[in-house]
């Protein structure tokens, strides 16, 4: 088998402009690859939506805060 | 690829300060914030800092507040990281190394400052 | 702040080992955890970030695991290029710490 994974790079040109509510958040994928043009954040909303974001922005960086610590309480 | 360029090791005297820089390429630093870790001879690592350039903001370990100054030139993509007051502990290799999510994907290749009278 | 422990300081193990290395924080550290592969004179390299995603490029035996403020890395059967040290770092919230690192050496 290989020794390392290759995975398809997903890359965040532009990102969203506005505060997404907490509870319409489902997931979040750090993207740091640097073949990409910028680090950022992609969230998955409940609806099954994608939409990239500014891991600089505050509200950003709390929402990842906040799926963080429910995602620990869920674990038995 | 990304590169982070440091400038060369230094020697300087006890109370001195020391000014270490560190150039990019391949990225724009205003995409990311640029950070600066330290290690002194045979020890581990410490995190010193970080500066947003975008906006300039810093924020630093309250070991270093007041006595450590990062800034920025987004015009040449370089950071800076000043240390003041110099003293025989601060002797170290001096790293920056980028990362928006506070873990360091890309480091320069170190910069030695030594303290000595 | 928060501090990290890594166990042990030092090993030694053969090549073909399997090698485990522990963090424990001093708090829940939600998964924000790194670790790090440094060789004498060189800067660190970033294995792993988020307690468990390899980056891109490192060899899969490398894994990590853990949760709340018990962290492991794992290497499941030791090359020769993995004799180095390895640091963990919190990065739950600043001022982020490291670990105070493991030196694997040859047996």
């Known amino acids: 088998q290989p020794d390392s994974v290759s995975i398809p790079i997903t890359c965040c040109f532009n990102v969203i402009n506005r505060k997404i509510p907490i509870q319409r958040l489902e997931s979040y994928t750090r993207i740091t690859n640097i073949q990409c043009p910028k680090e950022a954040v992609i969230f998955k909303t409940k609806r099954g939506k994608e939409v990239c974001a500014d891991p600089k922005e505050r509200w950003v960086r709390d929402s990842m805060k906040h799926l963080d610590q429910i995602f620990q309480n869920l674990k038995p | 690829q990304v590169q982070l360029v440091q400038s060369g090791a230094e020697v300087k005297k006890p109370g001195s300060s020391v000014k270490v820089s560190c150039k990019a390429s391949g990225l724009n630093i205003k995409d990311t914030y640029m950070h600066w870790v330290r290690q002194a001879p045979g020890q581990g690592l410490e995190w010193i800092g970080r500066?947003?350039?975008?906006?300039?903001?810093?924020k630093f370990d309250p070991k270093f507040q007041g006595r450590a100054t990062i800034t920025a030139d987004t015009s040449t993509s370089t950071a800076y990281m000043e240390l003041s007051s110099l003293r025989s502990e601060d002797t170290a290799v001096y790293y920056c190394?980028?990362?928006?999510?506070?873990?360091?994907?890309?480091w320069g290749q170190g910069t030695t400052v030594t303290v000595s009278s | 702040d928060i501090q990290m422990t890594q166990s042990p300081s030092s090993l030694s193990a053969s090549v073909g080992d399997r090698v485990t290395i522990t963090c424990k924080a001093t708090e829940d550290i939600y998964n924000r955890l790194a670790w790090y592969q440094q060789k004498p004179g060189k800067a660190p390299k970033l294995l792993i970030s988020g307690a468990t995603s390899l980056e891109t490029g490192v060899p899969s035996r490398f894994s990590g695991s853990g949760s709340g403020t018990d962290y492991t890395l794992t290497i499941s059967s030791l090359q020769p290029e993995d004799f180095a040290t390895y640091y963990c770092?919190?990065?739950?919230?600043?001022?982020?710490?490291f670990g105070g690192g493991t030196k694997v050496e040859i047996k």
């Open positions: 500066i947003d350039p975008a906006n300039g903001n810093t």
């Open positions: 190394a980028r990362g928006v999510f506070g873990f360091f994907d890309y």
């Open positions: 770092q919190q990065f739950w919230s600043a001022p982020y710490t």
